[in-house]
């Protein structure tokens, strides 16, 4: 049994890091493998992650972490029974994938303005809370070419757009994702999409 693709990990910089790797053949990850991880810190304890299958030869493990900070560094040991298959390390702050924003809502009752709001996925005491910027994707269910991205570079998790910038009388969907420049993160996954019917009063022409 050998590791074909070494584990690569990403952290949500809050409580979970996800590691993925590939074996050289079909593997029952949960029964045959264990990923041990330990913070390189005084008094830290070793933890064991039981991996799940991710395709025939692929495995994925969700590592639970407390109080993640930039100085943290973890040792990782991948075991198959008594055999050490791979040894490495992982610094969560250098591989951050933020959590996806939630609770995306479209408010259509503000005079010909669409107000989109969503929730910041981090608590106020997490460093990323004040450092997320967002991308909002809006698209038409009827017209695949009607697809647009709005970059939200301010901290408030909201976006206002004129309803008239979209076509009237048709349905639209929106979703939002986040990233943080400070840790050079990847983009988060998209939030679940929300749907609304866009209708607004056409301006009266003289």
């Amino acid at each position: 049994m050998k590791v074909l693709q070494e584990p690569t990990c990403v952290s949500d910089y809050m409580s979970i890091s996800t590691c993925e790797w590939k074996m050289n053949g079909p593997t029952n990850c949960s029964t045959e493998l264990r990923l041990l991880y330990q913070l390189v810190f005084l008094l830290s304890e070793a933890h064991t992650c039981i991996p799940e299958n991710n395709g025939g030869a692929g495995c994925v493990c969700h590592l639970l972490m407390d109080d993640v900070v930039s100085a943290d560094n973890y040792t990782l040991d991948l075991w198959a029974g008594q055999q050490l298959l791979w040894k490495g390390s992982f610094k969560p702050s250098e591989h951050v994938k933020p959590r996806a924003p939630g609770n995306l809502t479209v408010h259509t009752n503000v005079s010909d303005t669409l107000l989109l709001t969503w929730s910041n996925p981090y608590p106020p005491d997490n460093y990323l809370y004040n450092h997320l910027t967002y991308a909002v994707n809006i698209w038409s269910e009827n017209d695949p070419a009607d697809f647009r991205i709005y970059n939200v570079t301010y901290l408030e998790p909201s976006l206002r757009i004129a309803a008239s910038t979209l076509k009237s009388g048709i349905s639209y969907r929106a979703r939002v994702r986040a990233w943080a420049q400070c840790y050079n993160t990847t983009w988060s996954e998209w939030s679940p999409s929300t749907k609304w019917h866009n209708s607004y009063r056409e301006p009266f022409e003289q």
Epitope: F41, L43, S44, E45, D66, D67, V69, S70, A71, D125
Partner: antibody, heavy 116, light 111 residues
Framework: QVQLVQSGAEVKKPGASVKVSCKAS????????MHWARQAPGQGLEWMGI????????SYAQKFQGRVTMTRDTSTSTVYMELSSLRSEDTAVYYC?????????WGKGTLVTVSS | QSVLTQPPSVSAAPGQKVTISCSGG????????VSWYQQLPGTAPKLLIY???KRPSGIPDRFSGSKSGTSATLAITGLQTGDEADYFC????????????FGTGTKLTVL
């Protein structure tokens, strides 16, 4: 919100021991390390040691090795710092502080006076 | 005996800028991150800066930190009378055993 509530002031005689408590609330108690530091009157801060509330293991500054013991009670989310063989130089305000590499939150402090 | 050295005192007028230095060595500041604490008279210390230059939520951006080599600096701009306090730097040292030294402390007076 995070609160670290420390026990009240103590007056002790030289040679005695003192046990200071620090009750934590507003966060997952076993997820954060706890430090203890002290500050003699008009002096700076001095680090004493750190405890991992999850497993209960502790590590102490070399200066206090053999004289200090840090423990925790997960059922009450409380950490304790006991200092023995007290001398007058141990008169200080003793602080618990939540954190790992740095101290996010501090208790208000417990004044321990050692006097004959 | 603290291994992190700070000036005993600094002073400046309201609205001015002041800097406080913290000098250490290769086994502590040179190899770790620096934090800064503010201690108002009669109160417990409060985290002001961590990770060399990051501010906890609620700390105004008038406070900033930096690190270069084995020294660190706390800068306070737009001084206010409420900033009058003692300031301590802190880090950790893993040279022999893990320890968390604090700086000697600096008394800031707002004139």
């Amino acid at each position: 919100q995070v609160q670290l509530v420390q026990s009240g002031a103590e007056v002790k005689k030289p040679g005695a021991s003192v046990k200071v408590s620090c009750k934590a609330s507003g966060y997952a108690f076993t997820s954060y390390y706890m430090h203890w530091a002290r500050q003699a009157p008009g002096q700076g801060l001095e680090w004493m040691g750190i405890i991992n509330p999850s497993g209960g293991s502790a590590s102490y500054a070399q200066k206090f090795q053999g004289r200090v013991t840090m423990t925790r009670d997960t059922s009450t989310s409380t950490v304790y710092m006991e200092l023995s063989s007290l001398r007058s130089e141990d008169t200080a305000v003793y602080y618990c502080a939540r954190g790992k590499y740095w101290m996010y939150d501090w208790g208000k402090g417990t004044l321990v006076t050692v006097s004959s | 005996q603290s291994v992190l050295t700070q000036p005993p005192s600094v002073s400046a007028a309201p609205g001015q800028k002041v800097t406080i230095s913290c000098s250490g060595g290769s086994s502590n500041i040179g190899n770790s991150y620096v934090s800064w604490y503010q201690q108002l008279p009669g109160t417990a210390p409060k985290l002001l800066i961590y990770d060399n230059n990051k501010r906890p939520s609620g700390i105004p951006d008038r406070f900033s930190g930096s690190k270069s080599g084995t020294s660190a600096t706390l800068a306070i701009t737009g001084l206010q009378t409420g900033d009058e306090a003692d300031y301590f730097c802190g880090t950790w040292d893993t040279s022999t055993v893990w320890e968390w030294p604090f700086g000697t402390g600096t008394k800031l007076t707002v004139l």
